[in-house]
């Protein structure tokens, strides 16, 4: 029960986290104009990974996409890449984890398979969360560097061109969304990995047990995995516990016609 709860909670937390990573990646407010100690302007600038926007006091907002790839800073490209990798891994992790959930039965999937899938999705969530946190942190570092550079030189004259007020940018809402979302995805992934341990068949060696079916011998090797003929429903690796006790989730397996081919 605790394993199911841990797995379910891990899935939900990761789902929220990945939704947050997607939201952060799409948001325009990665960096926002710093209003502290600045002349009060009737224009508010903010930038995202994909476009920059200007909101006028009049209420009009104009956004312009970055229609160049080569002209963009390498750091911005790296952040984009990290966020996309995070989303892709997270999405695959979600897909895998849906099939791994104990509360969902798909055919005759075994606990060991579900355990492996849970672990896989958990690792994917952890990597996804780390990608998001890394991406947001790289962007934040870029902002801090630029902030102090522009503070040192508030007004710049570009090679004889017209002076422009050096707009300083500070952390936007997307950074905080990204950090929180990355953290949630990471936590969700850890929870999935913990749940995997509870789902996985124990590796302890048990006494060899023989079960004699009429006309056919099926041996149970130490380690508890059934050596079957490789056909039909009996190919499932069922765990035999001492005294023949089974877990409540385990369905008894009877010899089928395929065992006697």
């Amino acid at each position: 029960m605790a394993v199911t709860a841990c797995q379910g909670l891990g899935f939900v937390v990761s789902l929220i986290g990945i939704a947050g990573i997607i939201a952060a990646t799409c948001m325009d407010q990665w960096s926002t104009q710093d209003l502290y100690n600045n002349p009060v302007t009737a224009v508010f600038n903010y930038q995202g990974l994909w476009r920059s926007c200007v909101r006028e006091s009049s209420g009009f907002t104009e956004c312009r996409g970055y229609f160049t790839l080569l002209g963009l800073p390498a750091m911005l490209q790296a952040v984009r890449a990290l966020m996309i990798v995070g989303i892709v891994l997270g999405a695959i992790g979600l897909l895998v984890s849906i099939f791994a959930l104990k509360c969902i039965r798909i055919g005759s999937m075994e606990d060991s398979a579900k355990a492996n899938m849970t672990l896989t999705s958990g690792i994917m969530f952890i990597v996804s969360g780390l990608c998001a946190i890394a991406g947001v942190s790289v962007f934040a570092n870029m902002l801090v560097t630029n902030f102090w550079m522009s503070t040192a030189n508030m007004y710049t004259g570009m090679g004889g061109m017209v002076q422009t007020v050096q707009t300083r940018y500070t952390f936007g809402a997307a950074l905080f969304v990204g950090w929180v979302a990355g953290g949630l995805t990471l936590i969700g992934g850890v929870m999935m990995c913990i749940a995997c341990r509870g789902l996985a068949p124990e590796e302890t060696n048990y006494k060899a047990v023989s079960y004699h079916a009429s006309g056919h011998s099926v041996a149970y090797k130490p380690g508890g995995f059934k050596a079957s003929t490789g056909f039909g429903s009996n190919t499932k690796n069922k765990k035999i516990y001492d005294g023949g006790a089974r877990t409540e989730d385990e369905v008894q397996s009877y010899p089928s016609k395929h065992d006697y081919v």
Partner: antibody, heavy 118, light 113 residues
């Protein structure tokens, strides 16, 4: 078409208050800010402040804080400016104008002449 | 506050002449975010409210004759009337729309001979 209809001329005694109105028509009142501008005789234009009818957000020129109070009534699509503690210096024509691209003022009311005299 | 300096303060011209009105701001009105200059030109005829001619320093408002052209960037701006007509008799104001408080120039009075 867009129209801003302002209230009629006012003759006020010094120290008193006056409330000017600006009724908007021809557009969605809550979507655009309303600015107020003062023009004194033989003087230029002075921006007083703006109000967004949608959420009531205001921004004032520091020189008019405490002097002007901007409000709106969404039901009647009307913007108001109350001028308090009037002096002869406040005698002027007051315009309301709708915010537009580039923070410019696109549609103007016809103006309200306020005369402060004992 | 941003000071908007207009020159000349008044100007007398004959119909058909080309006129250039100047406006200088004490600080740049160029926004780095969208590379637009937040300067507006208005025309005020006697007994009327001001009328918007040009916003963003060079974007002509719809319905404004194309003889009116705005140019300039940063701190120096000009309004050019390519061929002055009798109906252009008015006071022309420039406005800072970038910094609060939004400030106007003292105006240039255009008179026709």
């Amino acid at each position: 078409q867009v129209q801003l209809q302002q209230s009629g001329a006012e003759l006020v005694k010094p120290g008193y208050s006056v409330k000017l109105s600006c009724k908007a028509s021809g557009y969605t009142f809550t979507n655009f800010g309303i600015n107020w501008v003062r023009q004194r005789p033989e003087k230029g234009l002075e921006w007083i402040g703006w109000i967004f009818p949608g959420d009531g957000t205001t921004k004032y020129n520091e020189n008019f804080k405490g002097k002007a109070t901007l409000t709106t009534d969404k039901s009647s699509s009307t913007a108001y400016m109350q001028l308090s503690r009037l002096t002869s210096e406040d005698s002027a024509v007051y315009f309301c104008a709708r915010f537009y691209y580039g923070n410019s003022f696109v549609n103007w009311g016809q103006g309200t002449l306020v005369t402060v005299s004992a | 506050d941003i000071v908007m300096t207009q020159s000349p303060s008044s100007l007398t011209v004959t119909a058909g002449e080309k006129v250039t009105l100047s406006c200088k701001s004490s600080q740049t009105l160029l926004n780095s975010g969208n590379q637009k200059n937040y300067l507006t030109w208005y025309q005020q005829k006697p007994g009327q409210p001001p009328k918007l001619l040009i916003h963003w320093a060079s974007t002509r408002e719809s319905g404004v004759p194309d003889r009116f052209t705005g140019s300039g960037s940063g701190t120096d701006f000009t309004l050019t009337i390519s061929s002055v007509q009798a109906e252009d008799l008015a006071v022309y104001y420039c406005q800072n729309n970038y910094f609060y408080p939004l400030t106007f120039g003292a105006g240039t009075k255009l008179e026709i001979k």
